[in-house]
């Protein structure tokens, strides 16, 4: 299934665009799942369709649910699924969990946190930008386009980063927040040729047809900040990106984890609804730094449904 | 730039299966609203358009062969391929692969076509 | 499927004349407002070339002797005016409904 999940807050504007893709000549018609029922084009209604866009002009908590977008075009039709949950505003200044979008580390070098979501909006520059709660001030942040800069970035810096903007439609304001945690990567460290920790070399991974996978290639780089560091996966030597395969994604964001005060990433391919093919694909965990590339090959076998043993 | 080039055998036998091979450049079929397509034109005659892939691995054939073709893409190696069994000497023809590309769904770039004939 | 009926068969015209082919479609092929419906050329030895998409734009690098119109189930495709190397081949096809069809072609010929 192509179906992503958004999120939030009653009484915000919430933009949500719908997971399959098209041309721009192809029409896209949006359902609300439960009741088949097609959502409306006209702007005056609070929540309508536009394009490959679903817009909440402001969202309710009312309005979470699945909602189904399909992509026509003159011979074929594609679908796509989007469940949005709105939540309630929180009295106190804590960002729960399920409000947070991806973490994104920084270091003295490097400390841009982009703001998530905005592409989908109309926005105009300034962003307001806030840490646990507080307003950011000072010389030392800098709010430039989409994203915040901070200026000699410490281990203080850490924390929940929230960035606030204006969303304008037909003349109308409304307001859109989206939280992220920023960490901050340790200066001093050493740099060492990748080892990749998870998957084994040439390991077997069972997996049921029909059911969806998860594959964690895991690897370490050295300690404290590495100046270029990467984790990904390759489909037969291909960039997972290139090989055009809808089902297989890799995790948006490299995860960042200090093992024993290594440096370390990780990096989740998930297969969706196994297929027979898939099990025919090599799989490659790729680690690589300035030292070197590492390759550990993984492939999948079929694992049978009444085979409960690990 | 783009271009799209066709290769496969000239002479197949009846009854036998046809494996053609599209090798383009200048564009990804990882890239949204992209497609590739194979038509044929028997000696003297009109196109005949048999089959396209999309950039999502949707796959779209002609009904009255779709029993008898396969198309698949490998986007890493930008290839497209095109099966088509027991062919028949009424299959004898030129095959050309071209992008389906633009904002609507048109053939804008079409290969130089391999000759096949179909002969015992 | 959609037929679609070529005439005439085959023509000859002056250099500096004008050229007339036209297409009928045994349905309709418009698809939100816009007429699905292209034209190709092609030369002998050669594959076909994509002239006019979407019934009435010009393919970037054809020239501006080459028009398209119509709407529906009627399209024309016009050279005005004709030069000698338009000697070829052309083809409307629709992309409206799959199976995609061609037209059986029509022969401009040079006098």
């Known amino acids: 299934k192509f179906s992503k999940q958004s999120w939030g807050l009653e009484n915000e504007a919430l933009i949500v665009r719908c997971p399959r893709q098209g041309k721009p000549s192809y029409t896209v018609d949006w359902y609300y799942s439960q009741t088949n029922k097609s959502i409306p084009t006209q702007e005056r209604n609070r929540v309508f369709a536009s394009g490959q866009l679903l817009k909440f002009l402001p969202a309710a908590v009312a309005d979470s649910g699945i909602y189904t977008c399909i992509v026509r075009s003159p011979t074929f039709n594609r679908t796509g699924y989007a469940n949005v949950t709105i939540y309630k505003k929180q009295s106190d200044c804590n960002v729960p969990d399920y409000l947070m979008y991806s973490t994104v580390s920084g270091s003295e070098k490097n400390s841009k946190i982009y703001c998530p979501t905005i592409d989908l909006y109309n926005w105009t520059a300034p962003l307001e930008w806030f840490k646990n709660c507080q307003a950011l001030q000072g010389s030392r942040y800098r709010a430039h386009k989409s994203f915040l800069v901070i200026d000699n970035v410490m281990t203080e810096d850490a924390g929940d980063y929230t960035c606030k903007f204006i969303h304008n439609e037909n003349g109308a304001n409304y307001s859109v927040t989206a939280t992220r945690s920023f960490t901050v990567k340790d200066e001093q460290g050493f740099s060492l040729f990748p080892v990749i920790g998870a998957p084994a070399q040439n390991e077997i991974k069972e997996v049921e047809i029909g059911k969806n996978a998860n594959l964690t290639c895991s690897a370490c780089f050295g300690k404290g900040t590495q100046f270029l560091a990467a984790v990904l996966w390759q489909l037969n030597g291909t960039k997972i990106t290139d090989f055009g395969e809808p089902r297989i994604q890799q995790e948006e964001g490299q995860n960042q984890s200090f093992s024993n005060g290594l440096a370390c990433l990780d990096m989740v391919l998930r297969i969706a609804d196994v297929k027979e093919e898939d099990l025919l694909l090599q799989y490659d965990c790729l680690a690589l730094n300035l030292h070197g590339l590492r390759r550990h090959t993984v492939r999948l076998s079929r694992k049978n449904p009444i085979d409960h043993h690990s | 730039q783009v271009t799209l080039k066709e290769s496969g055998p000239t002479l197949v036998k009846p009854t036998q299966t046809l494996t053609l091979t599209c090798t383009f450049s200048?564009?990804?079929?990882?890239?949204?609203?992209?497609?590739v397509g194979w038509i044929r034109q028997p000696p003297g005659k009109a196109l005949e358009w048999l089959a396209h892939?999309?950039?999502?691995?949707?796959?779209q054939y002609n009904p009255a062969l779709k029993s008898r073709l396969t198309i698949t893409k490998d986007t890493s190696k930008s290839q497209v391929v095109l099966t088509m069994t027991n062919m028949d000497p009424v299959d004898t023809a030129t095959y050309y692969c071209?992008?389906?590309?633009?904002?609507?769904?048109?053939?804008?770039?079409w290969g130089q076509g391999t000759t096949v004939t179909v002969s015992s | 499927d959609i037929v679609l009926t070529q005439s005439p068969a085959s023509l000859a015209v002056s250099p500096g004349q004008r050229a007339t082919i036209t297409c009928r479609a045994s349905?309709?092929?418009?698809?939100?407002?816009?007429?699905?419906m292209q034209w190709y050329q092609q030369k002998p030895g050669q594959p076909p070339k994509l002239l006019i998409y979407?019934?009435?734009n010009v393919e970037s690098g054809v020239p501006a002797r080459f028009s398209g119109s119509g709407s529906g189930t009627d399209f024309t495709l016009t050279i005005n005016p004709v030069e000698a190397n338009d000697t070829a081949n052309y083809y409307c096809?629709?992309?409206?409904?799959?199976?995609?069809?061609f037209g059986q072609g029509t022969k401009l010929e040079i006098k």
């Open positions: 071209a992008r389906i590309g633009g904002d609507y769904d048109y053939f804008d770039f």
């Open positions: 200048g564009f990804s079929l990882s890239t949204s609203g992209m497609g």
């Open positions: 892939i999309w950039w999502d691995d949707v796959k």
């Open positions: 349905e309709s092929v418009e698809y939100s407002g816009t007429s699905l």
């Open positions: 979407v019934a009435s």
């Open positions: 096809q629709q992309s409206r409904k799959v199976p995609w069809t």
